[in-house]
């Protein structure tokens, strides 16, 4: 907290400009009018104020707007946004997408901070819905934001947003989310050639159905085991030994190390032991020779 001291003669700020960087903290407190600051907030961003000086400017705005800043001020906070706490942000009513973009721009290239998470939450609540434009904006700045959304919210994500997604951004997505994202990714990347397509679609394959995995097995993609282990168990089970061998290519040898883990374990249980033996990996647990395989789920469907 800066002491209340009188502004020295001739130092009263008539406008927010670069000369203020030479003011000591107590001079900023004494000589800058909060109302002037509020009306000229857009200038602050271009001025290299120190972290400590920004503290004083924030304090002045807090005194002027104890109930929370108006959107006209919020939109022009610039780097002063970095000084805001989630508690400050919860007092705001942010409804303009331009305001959201302006503040996300300040944090661009950095991890999503608690301030940004709170801002997004306030914005979405203020709008009452997560519309396409909002999602477009959020996924452009934070592709990882996708995994924090429910499958219902994800359904309105435009396929064009998928292009910004990096593999690590999907690390926290669960299968239900990937089920929604995969068809969008398939649509987004549909015009790419085989190998390029696989590179892009690989991160989304946790949502792929059996028929798409079968199609990929015909394209010499050489899927790595880490990707294979993230596939939906129900999508992997119908694959034949030959199809899995083609899908994994040289990585097929990795199945041995994963034979006790899903989906490999469950897949092994569905294969004929004779077929598994053709891989030469010593995989055990397949259906013994001469046994008849009844698909009970199919039988129930017919009756």
């Amino acid at each position: 907290e800066v002491e209340k001291t009188a502004c020295p003669s001739g130092k009263k700020a008539r406008e927010i400009d670069e000369s203020l960087i030479f003011y000591k903290k107590w001079e900023l407190e004494a000589c800058v009018d909060a109302a002037l600051l509020a009306t000229q907030m857009d200038r602050v961003n271009a001025i290299p104020f120190t972290y400590e000086q920004l503290d004083v400017l924030k304090h002045k705005l807090d005194e002027l707007y104890p109930q929370g800043y108006p959107e006209s001020v919020i939109q022009h906070l610039g780097y002063l946004f970095l000084k805001m706490s989630p508690e400050d942000i919860r007092k705001w009513n942010v409804t303009s997408l331009e305001t959201l973009k302006a503040l996300l721009e300040v944090n661009k290239g950095h991890e999503m901070s608690p301030q940004v998470a709170t801002l997004i939450d306030r914005f979405v609540k203020g709008r009452g819905q997560l519309d396409k434009d909002t999602l477009d904006t959020l996924t452009a700045f934070y592709p990882g934001y996708l995994c924090s959304l429910s499958p219902e919210e994800l359904s309105s994500v435009p396929p064009s947003s998928i292009w910004a997604v990096r593999p690590q951004d999907l690390d926290t997505c669960d299968p239900r989310q990937l089920d929604v994202l995969y068809p969008k990714a398939r649509l987004a990347f549909q015009n790419m050639n085989g190998s390029e397509y696989f590179v892009k679609i690989q991160s989304f394959l946790g949502g792929a159905p059996t028929e798409d995995l079968k199609a990929l097995s015909q394209q010499n993609v050489s899927m790595d085991l880490a990707t294979f282990m993230k596939l939906r168990t129900d999508a992997v089970l119908p694959l034949t030994v030959a199809e899995v061998q083609k899908l994994l290519g040289p990585h097929v040898e990795g199945l041995k190390a994963e034979e006790r883990h899903r989906p490999v374990r469950d897949w092994i249980l569905r294969q004929r032991q004779d077929d598994l033996d053709t891989l030469g990996l010593g995989l055990q647990g397949g259906i013994p020779n001469g046994y008849l395989v009844l698909d009970l789920s199919m039988q129930e469907a017919l009756s």
Partner: nanobody, 117 residues
């Protein structure tokens, strides 16, 4: 965010000169105004010189005006501070920064300037 790298400090007698350099690699140097700051032991960090992004607007702290000269070389991504007629009260660690860096409290190591006989 790449931190600035300052150099050129040293021990100098009163009335002497030094030229400080600050290299800001990896950022969009042309986008930001830059400033030189200094911090004396136990004192608040203060701004001593400012140069706008186009290099046309230059401002100084009252106590250094006429003795210090700030300039920038866009091609070399470098900001300079020519310090002449140095005084003991100019002693401190000198830093340079841009608005984004200063706002995020990202600072380089600084360069020590000591003015003493």
């Amino acid at each position: 965010q790449v931190q600035p790298v300052e150099s050129g400090g040293g021990l100098v007698q009163p009335g002497g000169s030094l030229r400080l350099s600050c290299v800001v690699s990896g950022s969009d140097f042309t986008e930001d105004a830059m400033a030189w700051y200094r911090q004396a032991s136990g004192k608040e960090r203060e701004s001593v010189a400012f140069v706008s992004k186009d290099g046309k607007r230059i401002l100084y702290l009252d106590s250094v005006r006429g003795r210090f000269t700030i300039s920038r070389d866009i091609d070399k991504k470098t900001v300079y501070l020519q310090m002449d007629n140095l005084k003991p009260e100019d002693t401190g660690v000198y830093y340079c920064n841009s608005a984004p860096g200063a706002a995020r409290n990202y600072w380089g190591q600084g360069t020590q300037v000591t003015v003493s006989s």
